[in-house]
Amino acid sequence: VEVSEPDNSLSVSIPEPSPLRVLLGSSLTIPCYFIDPMHPVTTAPSTAPLAPRIKWSRISKEKEVVLLVATEGRVRVNSAYQDKVTLPNYPAIPSDATLEIQNMRSNDSGILRCEVMHGIEDSQATLEVVVKGIVFHYRAISTRYTLDFDRAQRACLQNSAIIATPEQLQAAYEDGFHQCDAGWLADQTVRYPIHTPREGCYGDKDEFPGVRTYGIRDTNETYDVYCFAEEMEGEVFYATSPEKFTFQEAANECRRLGARLATTGQLYLAWQGGMDMCSAGWLADRSVRYPISKARPNCGGNLLGVRTVYLHANQTGYPDPSSRYDAICYTGEDFVDIPESFFGVGGEEDITIQTVTWPDVELPLPRNITEGEARGSVILTAKPDFEVSPTAPEPEEPFTFVPEVRATAFPEVENRTEEATRPWAFPRESTPGLGAPTAFTSEDLVVQVTLAPGAAEVPGQPRLPGGVVFHYRPGSSRYSLTFEEAKQACLRTGAIIASPEQLQAAYEAGYEQCDAGWLQDQTVRYPIVSPRTPCVGDKDSSPGVRTYGVRPPSETYDVYCYVDRLEGEVFFATRLEQFTFWEAQEFCESQNATLATTGQLYAAWSRGLDKCYAGWLADGSLRYPIVTPRPACGGDKPGVRTVYLYPNQTGLLDPLSRHHAFCFR
């Protein structure tokens, strides 16, 4: 593109077609030449000739960023672009303003302008540059760190991608990509990009941000992989039906529509192109994912990116092929599927599926990886911000996580995405300016959206003749209570620590919880109705209450509490703007009440309280009682649901976030 004045004036040209498409991580040379018929210019006989002034800038969204300025043989580079941009031929060839850019990032896309000023003359040429491709982290279906170098490449190829290069990962890092998982790259090195160094993710760079590397590794070692999807000509689209699809049905539905299930790489490219769907769908590799381009709390926890629905809380395993989701299809002739047989043994079948048993969540690690790094991505998960939408697509955390979590965490969490209301959201049809406590019937207020990842269901608590047994965990973290603290925790919630007999009775009434908790006799137990790895405990595959026997009182677990009957009433309180935690306390007090304790809410639930909206409780937790299960209210079992901050079912929400409240008087 050339812009110039009439003949005999300064003219600048960039002899390249626009737009120029370049690969992420590659270098780019943009030729820019100028013809200066007035050269040299003198302002007066006594002054030296004026040298032409070259300026390169990038224009995007009405904003101009100067990359460099050159005059009289000297080049001044914008500090943000130091070591990234150069004029390779200047000043050796004074009329050659060719620009070289290293390691192109997505953020480098835009219009580049080469401008030359000489005296009062000014001419410029522009070129649109589009950086193609996206780097994504990929993990095998079974568990973390299972891919040798061959399988890593295969995983990328089967997902419409190729293994990424170090340059591509570096460019992605500079664009904001962050992942605390070691993955293979094309040069047989293993690396991972970290913006916010923290315990478990320091690697070889200590507390400095950057791409960590373990250097060249033996091809038999196993890690995850970083893939690079270049571009696609076809289209990714969603197919849905009221009852959704199993994996096989999804594949058939795409075929019926003249398409096929999209690959993970194709979905990443679609996301990069702006695709935004708050509903999870099957992909060709049997994974379940959904693309979020517009951050919102109820769709992926205010994080941008392609979110993945995992089976387990430690972000491994794909959902059961018989579970139901949308179908994500791809139509286009630009990809030709490589048959499984071209990689040897079919698909993932030759990857050992490893199971995790209590009390550790550690996975087998390659020799060079610290224990912390394997756990870093298990422990540190995203914090949904319920008020502010982030503007940059920088995933703060290693994983995307499930839109809805069923059951509680470790020993095992089984995660499913289902249609659900946002129990913490204000009803859209609510009466404005509510002052007094108002009870809404949830049937009137069902808003069909996907539940945010922080929300988790506690399986149905049985109603015992005299009261109710419930599992309790302080907001901070799992397995954090000594025996003494466990007893105090129950008392603080308005309950007492449960006895083995009470837990047994609860189990016989159908109570299941895959979390070890203290009981009155200083034993640690948990009730399992449907045994599954890793909830077998001391009973193998038989149902029953698992026990670890009497434990030293200094060991830490969760606790099972028992609440008898309610001396008073629990009521639901709300108003248009809802409450912060402290406002909820004040509001309850203004009603001659206090914020209800967890125990009081369980007792009220056992007497029939059913509310599809989560509210603050006295311990700073956010919960809601479901007596009549329905898909729109947290799943298919009755119980008191808890909204956690983290997908591993720990953490209290920010006390400044706004929700309803449950009061007790």
């Epitope: 170098f149 061959d150 490449q153 295969r154 190829l157 419409s160 991608a161 190729i162 293994i163 290069t165 094309a186 040069d187 047989q188 091809t219 270049e230 571009e231 696609m232 000509e233 002739e333 630009d334 990809f335 030709v336 599927d337 490589i338 040897g344």
Partner: nanobody, 115 residues
Framework: EVQLVESGGGLVQPGGSLRLSCSAS????????MFWVRQAPGKDYEWVAS????????YYDDSVKGRFTISRDSAKNTLYLEMNNLKPEDTALYFC????????WGQGTQVTVSS
Amino acid sequence: EVQLVESGGGLVQPGGSLRLSCSASGFTFSGSWMFWVRQAPGKDYEWVASINSSGGRTYYDDSVKGRFTISRDSAKNTLYLEMNNLKPEDTALYFCARSPRVGSWGQGTQVTVSS
């Protein structure tokens, strides 16, 4: 810029042999799985053979097993396909590929098996 350039095609009689070459540049050849794909006139693409990055594993379509051999020379950044006992049904345009995306393949080299 990634480039794959195929050569070595031609007209050959049934039972004859050919050796295709693919010269690669612009990417880490030694770290990539590589493939030969073919397309007969009016037919879909057909994957012929694959080789892993080290050259230690090779896989073939049943129709060419025992007749075709894929190999690589990482020092020369070159992929090969040795084709023996050629049949008329092997007639096709042969492409060298490093990914399933058609746009990233070479231009192809024509192999015609005819008496």
